[in-house]
Interface confidence: low
């Protein structure tokens, strides 16, 4: 058993056949010594008396809010949550496996630049009685500070018969060093509580591996005289790290016909312009990627040819 | 070339070669990004590699003030990785394919380190750790880790030379 926060405790249970469970001793936070009784949740049934209560926690029926009273007055509360290990594996029931980039990916994180700011998100089908708290650090043995905000509901989607809820959190490394080569990964830890179930999820990454630039901005076409060719130009996204002579991007320019089956013409360039042939009804798209490290491409920025 | 006393390197040549190194490092092991090598207990292997750290002066401001600190650190790393790529880890079984980019990568590391430091002038170089994996699978894992680490190192080096070529070239 360990303390999650004040008056909230997590009991780690092996969800095993005939497992004896965990013996837990609760102590009433009061100078009083006698006349103390204990109840669980909303029930008025007295579970025991005295300053301490010893219980055997085996299943969810044994978890909940234990309250000690004296003469009708509430003295203190202890909320017991269960963290269960089933068939040798800690349960991961609250969050949905996003399966990208690999199985058992519950948290996904992205950064728009090297400033030390990143966003993580996760999915669940649970709509009520759900709380999250997020902690992060750079490295684990001698952790350096990363400050995370509160997790918020960022999207709701309907998937077949189910509703899916996306939560996200923004974090910022306290003393980020954008130009350095990271040697210790960022660790992100999410505590999830659904009713009386506790679970924790972790992710470990280098900022360089989760970089995904915003799409190029101010995408423009300039027709070239007496030619089917156009000059496409664009700019670095505002959110990208500066100076651009140091934090450089590379770009992919694509000409795509109306039909998805039409052949795509692609050009790769380090410049912020390119000359391409603009076909009727086609569109021109440009995306960006870190020039020197193959992290994710940005989403496409697009303009129609006509 | 950098010369004793600390004049500028051939920024543009260094830029071209470091960008080529980035391309080679990724073609040597493109799928490495899909393996979470941190799960494989890499403390003893990649903790010893020279990293370009915050105080090494490789940021734009540090390069403007005095690029020598940063160039020395990059040189140190290039020699370190050049030795690793020429070691038993890469030359032993399982042998690399004949057209593997590792050979080119090895030669380019040496080329860039020589651009940074002419003969007869020696910066301190870091000792290469004695890594002698006993099993072929351990050697494979070590290769992945080294290439993964090299990708991060050469990315920073390439940024330094690109910025130097754009802003510090005479």
């Amino acid at each position: 058993i360990w303390e999650l926060k004040k008056d909230v405790y997590v009991v780690e249970l092996d969800w095993y056949p005939d497992a004896p469970g965990e013996m837990v001793v609760l102590t009433c936070d009061t100078p009083e010594e006698d006349g103390i009784t204990w109840t669980l949740d909303q029930s008025s049934e007295v579970l025991g008396s005295g300053k301490t209560l010893t219980i055997q926690v085996k299943e969810f029926g044994d978890a909940g809010q234990y309250t000690c009273h004296k003469g009708g007055e509430v003295l203190s509360h202890s909320l017991l949550l269960l963290h269960k290990k089933e068939d040798g594996i800690w349960s991961t029931d609250i969050l949905k496996d996003q399966k990208e980039p690999k199985n058992k990916t519950f948290l996904r994180c992205e950064a728009k630049n090297y400033s030390g700011r990143f966003t993580c998100w996760w999915l669940t089908t649970i709509s009520t009685d759900l709380t999250f708290s997020v902690k992060s650090s750079r490295g684990s043995s001698d952790p350096q500070g990363v400050t995370c905000g509160a997790a918020t509901l960022s999207a709701e989607r309907v998937r077949g018969d189910n509703k899916e809820y996306e939560y996200s959190v923004e974090c910022q490394e306290d003393s980020a060093c954008p130009a350095a080569e990271e040697s210790l990964p960022i660790e992100v830890m999410v505590d999830a509580v659904h009713k009386l179930k506790y679970e924790n999820y972790t992710s470990s990454f280098f900022i360089r591996d989760i970089i995904k630039p915003d799409p190029p901005k101010n995408l423009q076409l300039k027709p070239l005289k007496n030619s089917r060719q156009v000059e496409v130009s664009w700019e670095y996204p505002d959110t990208w790290s500066t100076p651009h002579s140091y934090f450089s991007l590379t770009f992919c320019v694509q000409v795509q016909g109306k039909s998805k089956r039409e052949k795509k013409d692609r050009v790769f360039t380090d410049k912020t312009s390119a000359t391409v042939i603009c076909r009727k009804n086609a569109s021109i798209s440009v995306r960006a990627q870190d020039r020197y490290y193959s992290s994710s491409w940005s989403e496409w920025a697009s303009v129609p040819c006509s | 070339r950098a010369v004793p006393g600390g004049s500028s390197p051939a920024w543009t040549q260094c830029q071209q070669l470091s960008q080529k190194l980035c391309t080679l490092a990724w073609s040597a092991h493109p799928l490495v990004g899909h393996m979470d090598l941190r799960e494989e207990g890499d403390e003893e292997t990649t903790n010893d590699v020279p990293h370009i750290q915050c105080g090494d002066g490789c940021d734009p401001q540090g390069l403007r003030d005095n690029s020598q600190f940063c160039l020395q650190r990059i040189h140190q790393g290039l020699i370190f990785y050049e030795k690793l790529l020429g070691s038993d880890i890469f030359t032993g079984e399982p042998s690399l394919l004949p057209d593997s980019p590792v050979g080119q990568l090895h030669a380019s590391l040496l080329g860039l380190s020589q651009l940074l430091q002419p003969e007869g002038h020696h910066w301190e170089t870091q000792q290469i750790p004695s890594l002698s994996p006993s099993q072929p699978w351990q050697r494979l894992l070590l290769r992945f880790k080294i290439l993964r680490s090299l990708q991060a190192f050469v990315a920073v080096a390439a940024r330094v030379f690109a910025h130097g070529a754009a802003t510090l070239s005479p």
Epitope: W15, P17, G88 | -
Partner: antibody, heavy 114, light 112 residues
């Protein structure tokens, strides 16, 4: 008393699907994962997958590459295992087993034959 | 997948004599929490498997104390101190340290 009661034997043609049920009683159905295991004649036991009845989350043995689907009907305290694209080598006894494998159903023989 | 190799394939024993079955795992089943995630089962002819031992060495309820489990993270052993006629059947080890859970090939215990 804990009990897992499975549906009766089935004979299927190659290419068909089979759905085996497992009705639980004597405990709170949603509190415990349900595993499915099969045993071909004279072969070792083979784990197929597991479901958490409370959330409907599943983990499958990749060997069955999308052929197996485990579901539950919590109102009926029943777990189901459906195996599609049946082949002769799927002839086996199929078992459901509660968390920790302490309690097993009696088994359902599925015969695949043309 | 973790491969479980069980020996012997067949084990003829005289009643009252001890018996030992070995199971080797291709990967350690010992977790950071100090527990070893291995089960032992007995499958009697025509019956479903029954759990004998879980967490490598803990006897399931109702299992006689002549059955014991021991081992390291990869080399596991089931011992029967004095074999009785009712102990005949096929014994299986099973790892539940990681998905997919896998079983050994089985050891058939017969009375001489």
């Amino acid at each position: 008393e804990f009990q897992l009661v499975q549906s009766g034997a089935e004979v299927k043609k190659p290419g068909a699907s089979v759905k085996v049920s497992c009705k639980a009683s004597g405990y709170t159905f949603t509190d415990h994962n349900m595993n499915w295991v099969r045993q071909a004649p004279g072969q070792r036991l083979e784990w197929m997958g597991v479901i958490n009845p409370n959330y409907g989350t599943t983990t499958y043995n990749q060997k069955f590459k999308g052929r197996v689907t485990i579901t539950v009907d919590t109102s009926a305290s029943t777990a189901y295992m459906e195996l599609s694209s049946l082949r002769s080598e799927d002839t086996a006894v199929y078992y459901c087993a509660r968390r920790g494998f302490a309690y097993w159903g009696q088994g359902t023989l599925v015969t695949v034959s043309s | 997948d973790i491969v479980m190799t069980q020996t012997p394939l067949s084990l003829p024993v005289t009643p009252g004599e001890p018996a030992s079955i070995s199971c080797r795992s291709s990967k350690s089943l010992l977790y950071k929490d100090g527990k070893t995630y291995l089960n032992w089962f007995l499958q009697k002819p025509g019956q479903s498997p029954q759990l004998l031992i879980y967490l490598m060495s803990t006897r399931a309820s109702g299992v006689p104390d002549r059955f014991s489990g021991s081992g390291s993270g990869t080399d596991l052993t089931l011992k029967i101190s004095r074999v009785e006629a009712e102990d005949v059947g096929v014994y299986y080890c099973q790892q539940i340290a990681e998905y997919p859970f896998t079983f050994g090939s089985g050891t058939k215990l017969e009375i001489k």
